[in-house]
């Protein structure tokens, strides 16, 4: 008797509940510094209930605000290491369509080895976000320290 | 005429908006690297609506996808305490039941004394999230500073 | 065939789905600790859908569990900037009405130049959200480095 | 079985050039982080340099930084090493390591290693 | 950077021995510590990692302990094949950093 059967009528894709967890795949190759990530039970505790992927990169499957949160930790990493190699910045942003590319939130390490952030943006469908991590660190892949998620809010 | 009122014939519990926000309440014994949380009205801004405290730990009651958020401040911190005392290290996870054991959430201080972070992952009706600080500093117990919630997401 | 469709009957507003998302326009001045804050879709990917701004500051217009967040990002900031100008703290609280003030989040920048978080609260119709940063150190205008929003959970 | 097949190695002067290869096999090579780690006759071992799993971040040793360049070639299963301005110290048997793939970063598999001279 | 102290350098013993090295972190690097052994003219091979994991395919008289600043590789009934140099290795930050080895050798 929980809501969604409650409206038994609607699929839970038509209540807008999209949401992806996400965990790091891998880098990106010369010149490229975005982040890959995979997600899908079989990989663990990552998911993908709406929004798809596109090569490694989170794609948008429903107009919304969204919360997108990202917590990326440095492998190899003390707050000597992290300050000796700064600027280590990361930013997560729409990298498409191109007529909508911005940057929707960015964080430095300084001399932390974790950032940790989220925040509410309004996407639409078919906006690609691309998590760029420049610097020379290599983020861990351990899912419990590095991963990236949206969570549809509203219309 | 909110969406609980217009939907009369349901609980607000049926709705599976099940939601906890917990204060600290005391670090463990040695040897105990567990927070032990406490929450409730009583208590000034601390909750639960459906999870339930278990000896200090919060267990879920209901199916679903979670956003699950922490943050913990070191009390008598400074940069130099922190970096001369790391590696203090914070880890959420699920403790019990032991089959579905697995670490969700971590993070370090390194020169820090807060650390803050959030992340969406499914969890079961049963499972008991322990959150552990390992390292010798001690965690403020001040509400705006330490706090460990929960919410439901979708199923 | 979204959930608001579904409920055609029910306007948006109705289901308690207020949430905004704020980007810094400017320091208080002298003596004043708060920042204040501006939103809508004319300035960017800020909007206000239920709350309101008075003077800067964000007023809740609907009971309920709410998810605040923010990110603040200071200007011109090195760790060792942030270690120098120590302490520079940043506090989330309910400024008004007087009788339920209170401090909801608080963080410091210790050797970081960014904090980040999010916590679980009850606010009430007609609290005022306020913001204070005290030290020397100015934020960043940036509106992917510096923000704050809220989110209607549940009742 | 995975195997790592270290090549390049050799005679050079000092000031000289000289490219290490590092063949891999048995394991899906895009996948994992790989290292250079070094061992001058009769020392211990130095790590030299590491490279993500797609190439686009590397990190260097102070003692090299600015002289030595890691590259990998994904599509070949190959990892480099352009060692440039060689100096006397940089004598030694050239490892290449793969790293585990939690991002622990102990290395799990080593080549034989080639053997790199500086001399006039 | 981190040094890492290995003791004893050097150490003579018989098959059938318990064997100790141990290495010491010149600051905290928590279970980041990694053990290998190395035959002569031939690469390392892990041993243990993160301070007390047995690496696959390892005998398990090969044991690891220690975190924090200080580690030890226990060798609990040595056999020929095991005489070597063995090195301890941190993978707790960059630069990564080894020990300078300890050589076991028949007594």
């Known amino acids: 008797q929980r809501f969604a059967q409650a409206q038994q009528q609607l699929p839970l894709e038509s209540l807008g509940w999209d949401v992806a967890e996400l965990q790091l795949n891998h880098t990106g190759p010369q010149q490229d510094p975005r982040l890959y990530w995979q997600g899908g039970p079989a990989l663990g505790r990552s998911f993908l209930h709406g929004p798809e992927l596109d090569k490694g990169q989170l794609r948008i499957h429903r107009d919304g605000i969204y919360m997108v949160h990202i917590q990326v930790t440095l492998a190899i990493c003390s707050s000597t290491t992290a300050s000796r190699h700064h600027p280590t910045t990361l930013a997560v942003g729409i990298c498409s369509p191109a007529s909508r590319s911005i940057s929707l939130l960015r964080l430095s390490f300084h001399q932390g080895c974790t950032i940790a952030s989220q925040r509410l943006t309004p996407l639409a469908r078919g906006d690609t976000l691309c998590t760029n991590l420049t610097g020379t660190l290599l983020p861990s892949r351990n899912t419990d320290e590095t991963f990236f998620g949206v969570q549809w809010v509203r219309p | 005429q909110r969406f609980a009122q217009a939907q009369q014939q349901l609980p607000l519990e049926s709705l599976g908006w099940d939601v906890a926000e917990l204060q600290l309440n005391h670090t463990g014994p040695q040897q105990d690297p567990r927070l032990y949380w406490q929450g409730g009205p009583a208590l000034g801004r601390s909750f639960l609506h459906g999870p339930e405290l278990d000896k200090g730990q919060l267990r879920i009651h209901r199916d679903g996808i979670y956003m699950v958020h922490i943050q913990v401040t070191l009390a008598i911190c400074s940069s130099t305490t922190a970096s001369r005392h790391h590696p203090t290290t914070l880890a959420v996870g699920i403790c019990s039941p032991a089959s579905r054991s697995i670490s969700l959430l971590r993070l370090s201080f390194h020169q820090g004394c807060t650390i803050a972070s959030q992340r969406l992952t499914p969890l079961a009706r049963g499972d008991t999230l322990c959150t552990n600080l390992t390292g010798t500093l001690l965690p403020s117990r001040n509400t705006d500073e330490t706090f460990f919630g929960v919410q439901w997401v979708r199923p | 065939q979204r959930f608001a469709q579904a409920q055609q009957q029910l306007p948006l507003e109705s289901l308690g789905w207020d949430v905004a998302e704020l980007q810094l326009n400017h320091t208080g001045p002298q003596q004043d600790p708060r920042l204040y804050w501006q939103g809508g879709p004319a300035l960017g990917r800020s909007f206000l859908h239920g709350p309101e701004l008075d003077k800067g500051q964000l007023r809740i217009h609907r009971d309920g569990i709410y998810m605040v967040h923010i990110q603040v990002t200071l200007a011109i900031c090195s760790s060792t900037t942030a270690s120098r100008h120590h302490p520079t703290t940043l506090a989330v609280g309910i400024c008004s009405p007087a009788s339920r003030s209170i401090s909801l989040l608080r963080l410091s920048f210790h050797q970081g130049c960014t904090i980040a978080s999010q916590r679980l609260t009850p606010l009430a119709r007609g609290d005022t959200l306020c913001t204070n940063l005290t030290g020397t150190l100015l934020p960043s205008r940036n509106t992917d480095e510096t923000f704050f929003g809220v989110q209607w959970v549940r009742p | 079985e995975v195997q790592l097949l270290e090549s390049g190695g050799g005679l050079v002067q000092p000031g000289g050039s000289l490219r290490l290869s590092c063949a891999a096999s048995?394991?899906?090579?895009?996948?994992?982080?790989m290292s250079w780690v070094r061992q001058a006759p009769g020392k211990g071992l130095e790590w030299v340099s590491v490279?993500?799993?797609?190439?686009?971040?590397?990190d260097y040793a102070d003692s090299v930084k600015g002289r030595f360049t890691i590259s990998r070639d994904n599509s070949k299963n190959t990892l480099y090493l352009q060692m440039n301005s060689l100096r006397a110290e940089d004598r030694a048997v050239y490892y290449c390591a793969r790293h585990d793939y939690s991002n622990r970063y102990y290395f799990d598999y080593w080549g034989q290693g080639t053997l790199v001279t500086v001399s006039s | 950077d981190i040094q890492m102290t290995q003791s004893p350098s050097s150490l003579s013993a018989s098959v059938g021995d318990r064997v100790t090295i141990t290495c010491r972190a010149s600051q905290s690097i928590s279970s980041y510590l990694n053990w290998y052994q190395q035959k002569p003219g031939k690469a390392p091979k892990l041993l243990i990692y993160?301070?007390?994991s047995l690496q696959s395919g390892v005998p398990s008289r090969f044991s690891g302990s220690g975190s924090g600043t200080d580690f030890t590789l226990t060798i609990s009934s040595l056999q020929p094949e095991d005489f070597a140099t063995y090195y301890c290795q941190q993978s707790y930050s960059t630069p990564l950093t080894f020990g300078g080895g300890t050589k076991v050798e028949i007594k």
């Open positions: 048995g394991f899906t090579f895009s996948s994992y982080a």
């Open positions: 993160a301070a007390s």
């Open positions: 490279i993500s799993d797609s190439g686009g971040i590397t």
